[in-house]
Structure formats: C-alpha cells, structure tokens
C-alpha cells in the first residue's frame, strides 16, 4: 500500500480467484483514543472499532472511503483504491491501446519543435468517474524538471457502438536546450483513476523522436507563362524552431488528381518552392520533416490547382 495523495491510498493486489488479498492497517487521524468506530462508504453498518483497524482487501467491495467516527462526529477519512496485477502484469483497463507505432501504446506524444514543449494524448471509452494526473521528468535516476498542465478532454468520437474520449496534456521542460544532443529520455507518467480502480501508464522518449512539424504555411501557386507548370511556394510553420538555417526542414510536394486511384507525382526538396505540373481538378499538397533526423512528417497543407 502507498499514498497517492493526502488520505488516498493505493492497494496493490495480485488478482486471481480466491486470492487472499492484502491486510491493510488504517489509523484514524485524531488525538482521540477511545470510542472510535469505522464505516465504509455510505453504509451505516459499523465495520469495527479502535484507533487502528486491520482490514483484508481482496476485491473492489473492500475498496472505498473508510471513515472513523466518534459520537456521531467524523474524525477522518481514508480512500482506498485498488491496483490489479494479473499474471504478473498490471491492469490496463482504463485506457485504450492505440496500437501505433506498436502494440501496448497507451500514451502518444508529439512535439512541434525542439523547445522542450510537447503534447501527450490517450484514449478511453469511459465517460464518468474518471480522473488523470500527469507527471514528467527528464531522466529517472536524477530527474530534471518537466512541468505538465492538467489533462483535459480534447475530443469525443463515435466508433461503431462506442463513444471514444481523447484526453491530452501539455508539458514543458523547465530548462530546455533546443540545440543540445539529448542523452536522457523524457519520462511521462499518467495516473488514471476510474471509480476505485487505479492504473498507471508511462512513456519514455527523446524529443527528437516525437518531432512532428506543423504543416507548411502560406502555400501559394504561381502559374508559369505559356506552360502547364506552376511554381508552388510555402513558408516554414510559425511553430518551428529558429534559426531555420540550423533547424532545417525538408519538404515533400505532391500533385494528386481528383480520384485517389490516379498516380501521384511527388517531388522532394529542401527549398521553400518547387515547380510542378498542375493537372485539371488536381490539388497540390506540401508537408515537412526535420531535414537531419527522420522523425514524423507533418500533416499536408493543400491548395487546389484551379
């Protein structure tokens, strides 16, 4: 058993049929010594008495808010949550496996640049009685500070019969050095509580591996005289690290016909313009990637040929 926060405790349980559970000692936070009784949740049925109580915790019916009383007055509360371990593996019932980039990916994180700011998100089908708390650091043995905000509901989607909820959080490394080579990874830890179930999820990464630039901005077409060709131009996204001479991007320019089956023409360039043939009803799209480290491509920025 360990303390998650004041008056909230997590009991770690091996979860199998007829498991004996854990014996937990509760102590009433009071100078009183006599006449103390204990109840669980909203029940008025008395569990037992005394300043300390030893309880067997083996299932969710044993978790909840234990309250000690004296003469009708509440003295203190202890909320017990359960963390289940089945076949040696901690449960992951609350969050959905995103399966990208690999199985058992519950947290996904992205950074728009090298400033030390990043966003993580996760998915669940649970809509109520759900709380998240996020902590982060660089390195784990001698951790350096990373400050995370509160997790917020960022999207709701309908998937078949189920509603899916996306939560996200923004974090900022306290003393980020954008140009420095990373040697220690960022660690992100999410505590998830659904009703009386506790779970924790972690992710470990280097900022360079989660870089995904914003799409190029100000995408424009300039027709070339007496030609089917056009000059496409764009700019670095505002969110990308500066100076651009050091934090350079490479670009992919694609001409896509109206039909998805039509052949795509692609050009790769380090410049912020390219000359392509603009077919009727086609569209031109440009995306960006770090020039020197092959992390994710940005989403496409697009304009119609017409």
């Amino acid at each position: 058993i360990w303390e998650l926060k004041k008056d909230v405790y997590v009991v770690e349980l091996d979860w199998y049929p007829d498991a004996p559970g854990e014996m937990v000692v509760l102590t009433c936070d009071t100078p009183e010594e006599d006449g103390i009784t204990w109840t669980l949740d909203q029940s008025s049925e008395v569990l037992g008495s005394g300043k300390t109580l030893t309880i067997q915790v083996k299932e969710f019916g044993d978790a909840g808010q234990y309250t000690c009383h004296k003469g009708g007055e509440v003295l203190s509360h202890s909320l017990l949550l359960l963390h289940k371990k089945e076949d040696g593996i901690w449960s992951t019932d609350i969050l959905k496996d995103q399966k990208e980039p690999k199985n058992k990916t519950f947290l996904r994180c992205e950074a728009k640049n090298y400033s030390g700011r990043f966003t993580c998100w996760w998915l669940t089908t649970i809509s109520t009685d759900l709380t998240f708390s996020v902590k982060s650091s660089r390195g784990s043995s001698d951790p350096q500070g990373v400050t995370c905000g509160a997790a917020t509901l960022s999207a709701e989607r309908v998937r078949g019969d189920n509603k899916e909820y996306e939560y996200s959080v923004e974090c900022q490394e306290d003393s980020a050095c954008p140009a420095a080579e990373e040697s220690l990874p960022i660690e992100v830890m999410v505590d998830a509580v659904h009703k009386l179930k506790y779970e924790n999820y972690t992710s470990s990464f280097f900022i360079r591996d989660i870089i995904k630039p914003d799409p190029p901005k100000n995408l424009q077409l300039k027709p070339l005289k007496n030609s089917r060709q056009v000059e496409v131009s764009w700019e670095y996204p505002d969110t990308w690290s500066t100076p651009h001479s050091y934090f350079s991007l490479t670009f992919c320019v694609q001409v896509q016909g109206k039909s998805k089956r039509e052949k795509k023409d692609r050009v790769f360039t380090d410049k912020t313009s390219a000359t392509v043939i603009c077919r009727k009803n086609a569209s031109i799209s440009v995306r960006a990637q770090d020039r020197y480290y092959s992390s994710s491509w940005s989403e496409w920025a697009s304009v119609p040929c017409s």
Epitope: G21, T37, E45, V46, L47, G48, S49, I55, Q56, V57, K58, E59, G61, D62
Partner: nanobody, 114 residues
Framework: QVQLVESGGGLVQPGGSLRLSCAAS????????MYWVRQAPGKGLEWVAT???????VYADFVKGRFTISRDNAKNTLYLRMNSLKPEDTALYYC????????RGQGTQVTVSS
C-alpha cells in the same frame, strides 16, 4: 427468530490455540456481516473481528495477526481461530449479527491460564 449458538471455548495455556464456532439460524446468514465480540470479567463488550459477505475480514488492533475469523455459508457457521493466546484474552466470546453485540448468542468462555 435469530439464533446464535457458540461453542469451542475452554481452558488453555498461554501460547495455546482454540477454534470457536457459532451456528446461526433464523436469518439469511450469507447476506449478513458477522462479528465476534468479547467481554472480559468486569469489563464492557469489546469488538474482536468482522467478516463481510464477500469473506473479507476486519480485525481489532489487539488481534495483531493472532486470530482468524471465517465463515461457511453452506453450514451457516461462523468461526474464530485463536492462536498465541494470552491471559488478557480471557473473556466470554460471543458471535453477533451486529457490531454492538445486541443480536448475540449466549457466549462461550475462553480462559487462558497456566
């Protein structure tokens, strides 16, 4: 009507063991929390242990791992296994349907003495 009949008490030396039993009838035993309480000579009733309907248990501080409460719903019987008995465990032990011992049996005497 509710009937609770305790048995298994006796005279035992310090460090010895006993198993108390309580046969219950007249109510739905399996859906009731059950309790052991005791009364030492010249003292008031003292709660010892509780077993909930899911078989999870709760113990008083003085028990310190020495006693085990259990139930057999098929037999409508409550048990208290007492190990490492001390002279201060000498008391009349009652099985009860409520924490305050209002619905309790006649009790079984446990005496710990050398």
């Amino acid at each position: 009507q509710v009937q609770l009949v305790e048995s298994g008490g006796g005279l035992v030396q310090p460090g010895g063991s006993l198993r108390l039993s309580c046969a219950a009838s007249g109510f739905t035993f399996s859906s009731s929390w059950m309790y052991w309480v005791r009364q030492a000579p010249g003292k008031g009733l003292e709660w010892v242990a509780t077993v909930k309907t899911n078989n999870s248990t709760v113990y008083a501080d003085f028990v310190k791992g020495r006693f085990t409460i259990s139930r057999d719903n098929a037999k409508n019987t409550l048990y208290l296994r007492m190990n490492s008995l001390k002279p201060e465990d000498t008391a009349l032990y009652y099985c009860a349907r409520d924490y305050a011992g209002r619905l309790r049996g006649q009790g079984t005497q446990v005496t710990v003495s050398s």
